[in-house]
Structures are given as C-alpha cells and as structure tokens.
Interface confidence: low
Amino acid sequence: QDSPPQILVHPQDQLFQGPGPARMSCQASGQPPPTIRWLLNGQPLSMVPPDPHHLLPDGTLLLLQPPARGHAHDGQALSTDLGVYTCEASNRLGTAVSRGARLSVAVLREDFQIQPRDMVAVVGEQFTLECGPPWGHPEPTVSWWKDGKPLALQPGRHTVSGGSLLMARAEKSDEGTYMCVATNSAGHRESRAARVSIQEPQDYTEPVELLAVRIQLENVTLLNPDPAEGPKPRPAVWLSWKVSGPAAPAQSYTALFRTQTAPGGQGAPWAEELLAGWQSAELGGLHWGQDYEFKVRPSSGRARGPDSNVLLLRLPEKVPSAPPQEVTLKPGNGTVFVSWVPPPAENHNGIIRGYQVWSLGNTSLPPANWTVVGEQTQLEIATHMPGSYCVQVAAVTGAGAGEPSRPVCLLLEQAMERATQEPSEHGPWTLEQLRVDLEVLFQGPGSGLNDIFEAQKIEWHEARAHHHHHH
C-alpha cells in the first residue's frame, strides 16, 4: 500500500572536529521509497563537484571538506556556524521535511577574560583566584594547575565557579604557582602563572602598633614587558618601599593606584591590589598611555596602617593593540563611504588621535592611504570606476598606527545589483564571509589574503556565481 514519506531519523546538531568528513543522517519511510534531497540554509545542495557534499545511498550526507577548524584570528573568534542542514524525503504522495540540524566548528579564543593574579592569603581564611576563560565553542571546561600539576579539587575545600577557584580555608601547603587552563575540542589555553603566598595569622592585641608604622614609597619603575605575554603585553610596574616603626607588625601590603585627573578635577577612585611582597612587589592591571598615582598601605587582619606618600608615573603610549571594529564599505553617488567603530577602550593604549585608512593594491582603487584626524570614524572616497574596493583601517595614538582591521571589500557593480534585487540581503562582504565560499570552491583551506588577491578576478567571479546559487 502506497504511503506518503515520513522522517524516521532526523539529522542532529553536531560539532565538526575534523579532519572529516562530517556526517548528517536522515532516514525516511514511505511507499514508493522516497528520494532524499538535502538543503543547506534552505537552499538545495547541488552535489556536483566542486560542491564538497556527497550523498550516500542510505540518505546520509557527507561533508567532505568543511572549512578549517575555528581559531582565534586578530583577537576575534571566527564564526562557529557552518549552517543549518535539512533533508527532504519525497515520493509521488508528498514531501516530508526533517528538523534542521546545525553544523558548527570548535573555537577557542586566545585571550582570557580575567587572568589570575598574584596574591597573599592568611592561613585558615578563604581566598579566591579569579579566572575568566577565553570565549569558546563548545564552552571550555576550566581546570586549575598548581606547580605544574593539576590541582585535585577537594569537596568542601575547593570550589570552582565560573572558572574562578575559591579556597575555603587556606593552608600553608596551598602556597605555590597556580594556572587556570581552559580546554575544549578546539584545544587548550593557559592563563598566566599566579603566585600565591600563605602567611601565618598574627593577632596583634595592639593594632595601635600598626598605626605607628611609617611607609616610604621609594620607587615606581616600569618593568620590561614579559616576552611570554606575546606581542601585546600589558604594562606592569615594580613598587619598592621602606618600612619604619615597630617591629614589622604588618601582615600584608596593599597597593593603591589611580589614573591622574586634570588639576582641579575630582580624583578617580583608588583601585586596590594585595601585594605579594614585604618591601617590593610587581603590580599589573594598568593601561598604556595613562598617568598614574601610586601609594602603599600596610594592614594586619582587619586593621589598616597609614598610607605611604604618593608617587606619580606616566606610562608611555603604545600603538593600539586591536584594530577598529565593524569596518563597513557602502556605495555612494560616485563615492565609497568607509565607516568603523573605535577599538575597545582597553586596547587604546593611549589617546586615539585619529585613524589611518589604506586601500589595497590590485583592486580598482590604486594603493593609497588617508589620515582621518580626531574622533571622526568615517571617510568618503571619490571614485567613478566600477569594480572591487578593498580597505583596511588602523587606529593611531602618539606612538603610531596600531594593527589594521581585516580587509573589507565591496564590489560596486554587485552592490548596485543587490540594492535592486535583494534589498533584505546584508551589506558588503568581508573577506571572512567570502572565505568559506572560496574554500569550498577551491577544495582546500583558505590560502591567505595575498593568494586571494592574486587570483582575484577569477575568485570574485566564481564566488559571486556561488553566492547567487546559495542565496
């Protein structure tokens, strides 16, 4: 007896972890036996080379060559989403459509959201080592390592919450070097090593003694960047101080620091950081291009001693450590509009005095660059030729131009076609958006920007054809 198709096994969401192939299953019943057709983001798959999809006789879809596994690039996670697959089973009595299954890639960014810091804790008291793991897909698991070995979490004594390690009762054996390790199927990332010192509790019956302590902050020195921190180190300073007064009643010392405001302005609030030292210590958490005030305060349990004198230090400006964001190209009347958003504040590394915009050679614009002064975040470039326009933008501080954004390209004739044919379609393509199409076309992982530009005319022509086929 004839019957319409029914999906028995729906494709499942899955993570592509390479090197391949990825498989999507679909099984259907029906009489006559239905034929299976697959769609990606609602568009039928051609299955004709060089399409990397292949259909097995049982209806299973193989994705032979998915894009390279996600990785951090210029501090930005690549899209983890390769698309939503659905299968259709059809016979003469009708068509059944499966649930959509999302195929995504594993990604783990380089940068920790919060790095653990050196600290001093007191025996019997609780302390927390903070760690904000890098963004990842799937969400990374966090483990803690101590002195080069994984830390075995003891129920009731250790708690890990959101990546941070809470130690309920400090013991002398907790002293050591701690590291937070984030792991997912894209790999693993290690935080900086944080030194934890554990002190014996000292109950002074006379906190009055603490009030008699005098602290002279003698030196604040900018430290050489740690090569282990990579090409964009954050500044750190070395504080050294002298203590006079009663016999060292202070259990610990805290650095207080703030950015200096203009004369007559209201002072910024003081930030506090427990120091892992008794006469000198390193202090991080600062930003390039700022003027800072520093002082040191002794404490013993809950009792605080008087603050030291204040020392000033100007941290030099550096080039911005991140590119401008959301760079877009839009066609105008005989012009091309470039616009962007400044880099995140923590990456300014000084005062942004303007922006540098480059056009890339080998396109319709000759190689050129423009300087945009001040806070303006757009530029109008006059042009009368159709063709492809590719630009990069970098932020500029007193130290020079920072890293440029990824190239963004606009195909003028295509932008006009789109404006008339597909008003709901998103704006210009970035090379990142094109890369997936180009990899599929050329049956291999993306060959880098230079190669993309070398073969640009062919690639752009084919990528457009491919894009229209998919959308």
Epitope: T141, S143, W145, G148, K149, P150, A152, Q154, T183, H188
Partner: antibody, heavy 119, light 115 residues
Framework: QIQLQESGPGLVKPSQSLSLTCSVT?????????WTWIRQFPGNNLEWMGY???????DYNPSLTSRISITRDTSRNQFFLQLESVTTQDTATYYC????????????WGQGTMVTVSS | QPVLTQSPSASASLGASVKLTCTLN???????IGWYQQHRDKPPKYVMF???????SKADGIPDRFSGSSSGADRYLTISNIQAEDEAIYFC?????????????FGSGTHFTVL
Amino acid sequence: QIQLQESGPGLVKPSQSLSLTCSVTGYSISSGSLWTWIRQFPGNNLEWMGYISYAGGIDYNPSLTSRISITRDTSRNQFFLQLESVTTQDTATYYCATPGGYPFHFDYWGQGTMVTVSS
Amino acid sequence: QPVLTQSPSASASLGASVKLTCTLNSQFSTYNIGWYQQHRDKPPKYVMFVKGDGGHSKADGIPDRFSGSSSGADRYLTISNIQAEDEAIYFCGADYNNAGQYGCVFGSGTHFTVL
C-alpha cells in the same frame, strides 16, 4: 590528531631495569596535558604508574615510588619510563596515555607494548 | 585513596539494555569517575565522564546508546539497544589527591558479553 607509540624491549631479566619510550606525534608534550604510563597485568587489572606534566611536574603511584622514574625529552617529543629491580610481577602490557580535557580521563592511548620479566 | 568496585561479569541480549555499576568506597562517594571500554587486544578507549551529581559528558564518537548516571556512591554506565560490538571489558577510573600527591585508580573491570 594526537598519536602515542610505545617502544622498548619485550623481555627483561629479573632484578634488571625496564626502560620504555613513548613517542608522541600531533602535539607537543611541552604544550599541555599529563603524559602518563599505565600498565595492564595478565588478569586485565589496570594500574596507573605515574605521569610527567607538560610543565615538568611529576607524580608516581605510591606503590612504585622507590623504583620508578619518568622523564622526557621535549626536543624529540618523547617521554620515558624506567622501572628498577623488576620481578615477574612486573610482567604486563605497558601503555602510554594522555587526557584530552579532564586531567585524569585518558582520551588518547598508545597501542601498548607487552613486557615479560623472565630469566 | 578511592577504591572502585565492579562486578566481574555481566551479559545481555542483542537489542536489550544493561546497566554496569562502579561503586566508590564511602569516604569518596562524591567523586567523579571515567568509564573505559576495552576490546580484546586493543588499548582501553575512553567512553565518558560521570560526575557525582549524575551529570555526564561523552567522549567524541561515542553513540547515544551509551549514557551515564549516579546514585550515592554508585556510578552507572547504561548501554541501550545493545550491539555485538559492545562486547568488551568496561573499566571505571577515578583520580585522587593524597597530601598533594595526585593519582588515579581503576576498578577491576566488568567483562560484558552480548548474548
């Protein structure tokens, strides 16, 4: 893909030392993880012997501490097991293994090498 | 350190279900464990991580027929719709920390036979 391969003599005389090498491909042993030796006795029981971590930290099974040593050569991406004063009780299949995520859950294993202790 | 107890053998029919048990000694009843599958003449293969609260996390490529759960000091590996290739020895393993010494112990293994 991480791959591990054990190598070393299949026959050792009692009271001598047993030396095995684990060669790792697809991942640097100084980049992460715990590089572990596990053995399986003829009755199928598994015994964790010890590890050297990517940072050089070492822990051994307390029952073996007096006669085990695990070392590494990061330039050759290998780590080694040395077991002194062996007896017939050390006859086993020796595996090197490493976890992929959670520290003591071993996702990657070598094929194993059978070592017989006999005179 | 923890002691993990497994029954020596278990069996079930093709297409049926089986629940293998790994029991921790009482002072370690909150510990997480890992399950491993070992076919003849092959190294053990990591199957999943079972937490003290019953949550579990499967290794890549492990079919949905395998699941984990927990009750008190017992950790379970359930195999449903049993296939011939599921015949193997199943081991559980747990890590421990003893005065800063970190290590791992295994259960003695359950020989699982498909009837």
